[in-house]
């Protein structure tokens, strides 16, 4: 049985390392739910489509989220 069908949370480990917003393909923020009790942040990198779980409590990741949301608000009309 694939792991993804049997577990509630996606992240096995979380990274505290800063991520360059330019190297990001996509950033998913999955809020807590009945399936997983905590927020999960999954970054899809441009390089080889690598996906990385980020630590929501990390200062570097909080700064990344701010930078990404600022970028989005600039783009929206």
């Amino acid at each position: 049985i694939p792991l993804s069908r049997t577990v509630r949370c996606t992240c096995i480990s979380i990274s505290n390392q800063p991520v360059n917003p330019r190297s990001l393909e996509k950033l998913e923020i999955i809020p807590p739910s009945q399936f997983c009790p905590h927020v999960e942040i999954i970054a899809t990198m441009k390089k080889k489509g690598e996906k990385r779980c980020l630590n929501p409590e990390s200062k570097a990741i909080k700064n990344l989220l701010k930078a990404v949301s600022k970028e989005r608000s600039k783009r929206s009309p």
Epitope: I1, P2, L3, S4, T6, V7, R8, C9, T10, C11, I12, S13, I14, S15, N16, Q17, P37, H38, I42, A43, K48, G49, E50, K51, R52, C53, L54, N55
Partner: antibody, heavy 124, light 108 residues
Framework: QVQLVESGGGVVQPGRSLRLSCAAS????????MHWVRQAPGKGLEWVAV????????YYADSVKGRFTISRDNSKNTLYLQMNSLRAEDTAVYYC?????????????????WGQGTTVTVSS | EIVLTQSPGTLSLSPGERATLSCRAS???????LAWYQQKPGQAPRLLIY???SRATGIPGRFSGSGSGTDFTLTISRLEPEDFAVYYC?????????FGQGTKLEIK
């Protein structure tokens, strides 16, 4: 530096129990999934169990399911393996290993840090 | 359970030669879920490759991984004396995680 140190191995009779510990240092233990992997004398590697970073999700190899329990204490930076109803075929070197930073069900970064191993011998 | 079969069981080569190690899965494995490890006698395994083709930190450029689906390859472009060891592939796309039986790379 980043380090994992296993302890608790020894000689034990079949049917008895043993608890292995793995002390982590040099990194934020609570951010990483952790594994136990074993290697019987002269044989290859066999994955035993995994526990997610926050401890809520655990998986086991069929060969140990119902007998072994993986757990962790993030406040003590320690991983455990409780082994009950031990059998001769459980004789092996037991390694703890760290799952790479950011690993998920979508993409794995491998077991990037390993301990030196602790030897468990099950014999009457 | 996904079974990984490595070949050859033993590979005898000389330093400077190219080594090609194969890992075949009994069912399809996402390339993001395959790793290679090196193990020397009396030592713990060392991660070489993750995601089928990405080198782990500190691994020399002579090591490379490739493949997808059911067929994966570890290549060592030019063997150094310290490369003679046992190599394992591992999948972790489905539980239980499994290792191949290993390929022993020995000096000819």
């Amino acid at each position: 530096q980043v380090q994992l140190v296993e302890s608790g191995g020894g000689v034990v009779q079949p049917g008895r129990s043993l608890r292995l510990s793995c002390a982590a240092s040099g990194f934020t233990f609570s951010s990483y999934g952790m594994h136990w992997v074993r290697q019987a004398p002269g044989k290859g590697l066999e994955w035993v169990a995994v526990i997610w970073f926050e401890g809520s999700i655990k998986y086991y190899a069929d060969s140990v399911k119902g007998r072994f329990t993986i757990s962790r204490d993030n406040s003590k930076n320690t991983l455990y393996l409780q082994m009950n109803s031990l059998r001769a075929e459980d004789t092996a070197v037991y390694y703890c290993a760290r799952e790479g930073a950011g690993s998920s069900l979508y993409y794995y970064y491998g077991m990037d840090v390993w301990g030196q191993g602790t030897t468990v011998t099950v014999s009457s | 359970e996904i079974v990984l079969t490595q070949s050859p069981g033993t590979l005898s080569l000389s330093p400077g030669e190219r080594a090609t190690l194969s890992c075949r899965a009994s069912q399809s494995v996402s390339s993001g879920h395959l790793a290679w490890y090196q193990q020397k006698p009396g030592q713990a395994p060392r991660l070489l490759i993750y995601g089928a083709s990405s080198r782990a930190t500190g691994i020399p450029g002579r090591f490379s991984g490739s493949g997808s689906g059911t067929d994966f390859t570890l290549t060592i472009s030019r063997l150094e004396p310290e490369d003679f060891a046992v190599y394992y592939c591992q999948q972790y796309g489905s539980s239980p995680y499994t290792f191949g039986q290993g390929t022993k790379l020995e000096i000819k």
